[in-house]
């Protein structure tokens, strides 16, 4: 014959544990029902009556089967530098993540406690490592033969165009200017040019296979900077 199913509350066999979605009540010394997610224990069980559950109130939640006397409060509303990626319901907490152009400088169990604006690389510097949800942009000086004339959290250093005849040599923050209407060739569009190891800009040691390549790469004027993001600390 199959063993009889015990209904809560019941006294567990010595040395055994309560079943899934049950808990052992120390006071009643019985196995009692847990409350489902979105509920909490309004009345704890006794030897003769099971747990009485009730729904969580607005702005509170329980995510797991539980026997807590009160639901947990949802986190405060997301700040202006965040977006709500999960709403507060009876069964889940609100989750705030950083809005585009920001990263999480201080995380919490779920979501982000403190967002910070992604660093913008100034002219003469390019993005060497892009920002992620949890890490800032890393800016590095443009290597010889490359430039960035923007203030940006996404722009990398781009190669100078190569001219038949150079009107103005390129540098770290300005492309070469050609005398003719079009350059002889340009590096592959979209090619990633991160700073190169052991290049010494001021000594002009970059290879110059054609006399028309721009020799000088010290910083020069940027083209239209954008102001720092609000709340930026420059870290």
């Amino acid at each position: 014959l199959p063993a009889q199913v015990a209904f809560t509350p019941y006294a567990p066999e010595p040395g055994s544990t309560c079943r899934l979605r049950e808990y052992y009540d120390q006071t009643a010394q019985m196995c009692c029902s847990k409350c489902s997610p979105g509920q909490h224990a309004k009345v704890f069980c006794t030897k003769t009556s099971d747990t009485v559950c009730d729904s969580c109130e607005d702005s509170t939640y329980t995510q797991l089967w539980n026997w807590v006397p009160e639901c947990l409060s949802c986190g405060s509303r997301c700040s202006s530098d965040q977006v709500e990626t999960q709403a507060c319901t009876r069964e889940q907490n609100r989750i705030c993540t950083c809005r585009p152009g920001w990263y999480c400088a201080l995380s919490k169990q779920e979501g982000c406690r403190l967002c910070a604006p992604l660093r913008k690389c100034r002219p003469g510097f390019g993005v060497a490592r892009p920002g992620t949800e949890t890490s800032d942009v890393v800016c590095k000086p443009c290597a010889p033969g490359t430039f960035s004339n923007t203030t940006s959290s996404t722009d990398i250093c781009r190669p100078h165009q190569i001219c038949n005849v150079v009107a103005i040599p390129g540098n770290a923050s300005m492309d070469a200017v050609c005398t003719s209407t079009s350059p002889t060739r340009s590096m592959a569009p979209g090619a990633v040019h991160l700073p190169q190891p052991v290049s010494t800009r001021s000594q002009h040691t970059q290879p110059t296979p054609e006399p028309s390549t721009a020799p000088s790469t010290s910083f020069l004027l940027p083209m239209g900077p954008s102001p720092p993001a609000e709340g930026s600390t420059g870290d």
Epitope: R119, K120, C121, R122, P123, G124, F125, A128, R129, V138, C139, K140, P141, A143, S173, P195, Q196, P197, V198, S199, T200, R201, S202, S218, F219, L220, L221, P222, G224, P225, P227, P228, S232, G234, D235
Partner: antibody, heavy 119, light 106 residues
């Protein structure tokens, strides 16, 4: 907490060289370039140059191209400046300062190292 | 290279005064100017970056403004702790400091 700890004062003979250090802590050393700045006694600040610890690349003010050599050691998070062919003109305090390549150059500085050139 | 002409070289002010220091660049620096305070025997301290953005911990009595080639730095209500030298720095074309301004109290 970000800190740039520089080595102690140096005395050098004319014609000799000195190498001073700047040990970084509290941040990712390779994410920032390191500048060096000279301040002669009672004078203003002069930019010497920078080193990128990650790649070893450097740039110098024209005036210091033959005088200073900037290097960095990522294993010890330390940047160095070597001053060669010392003369009395090199007697000064030398500062290191980091730069994030964004809006805040020199947001943290070392305490400075006094180099005295004397025979 | 860009030159930075800073004036005046020295300033004498009474407590509570407003003082202004100017820096003129030899060419347009597109707001890439920072201001530093240096007290005797100490390293400089960044006060203002990108013309007018106060660094964290910089008192609100400090301010900066300007564009193109001309920039200014002001202390609106001078306090005794402001006795120091002040330097501008352009950081768009390599880096160049101004010659400095020494602030004294009358």
């Amino acid at each position: 907490e970000v800190q740039l700890q520089q080595s102690g004062p140096e005395v050098g003979r004319p014609g000799s060289s000195v190498k001073i250090s700047c040990k970084a802590s509290g941040y990712t050393f390779t994410d920032y370039i390191m500048h060096w700045v000279k301040q002669s006694p009672g004078q203003g600040l002069e930019w010497i140059g920078w080193v990128d610890p990650e790649y070893g690349s450097t740039d110098y003010a024209e005036k210091f191209k033959k005088k200073a050599t900037l290097t960095a050691d990522t294993s010890s998070n330390t940047a160095y400046i070597q001053l060669s062919s010392l003369t009395s003109e090199d007697t000064a305090t030398y500062f290191c300062a980091r730069d994030d390549g964004s809006y805040s150059p020199f947001d943290y500085w070392g305490q400075g190292v006094m180099v005295t050139v004397s025979s | 290279d860009i030159q930075m002409t800073q004036s005046p070289p020295s300033l004498s002010a009474s407590l509570g005064d407003k003082v202004t220091i100017t820096c003129q660049a030899s060419q347009n620096i597109n707001k890439y100017i920072a201001w530093y305070q240096q007290k005797p025997g100490k390293a400089p301290r960044l006060l203002i970056r990108y013309t007018s953005t106060l660094e964290s911990g910089t008192p609100s009595r400090f301010s900066g403004s300007g564009s193109g080639r001309d920039y200014s730095f002001s202390i609106s209500n001078v306090e005794s702790e402001d006795i120091a030298s002040y330097y501008c720095l352009q950081y768009v074309n390599l880096l160049t400091f101004g010659a400095g301004t020494k602030l004294e109290i009358k």
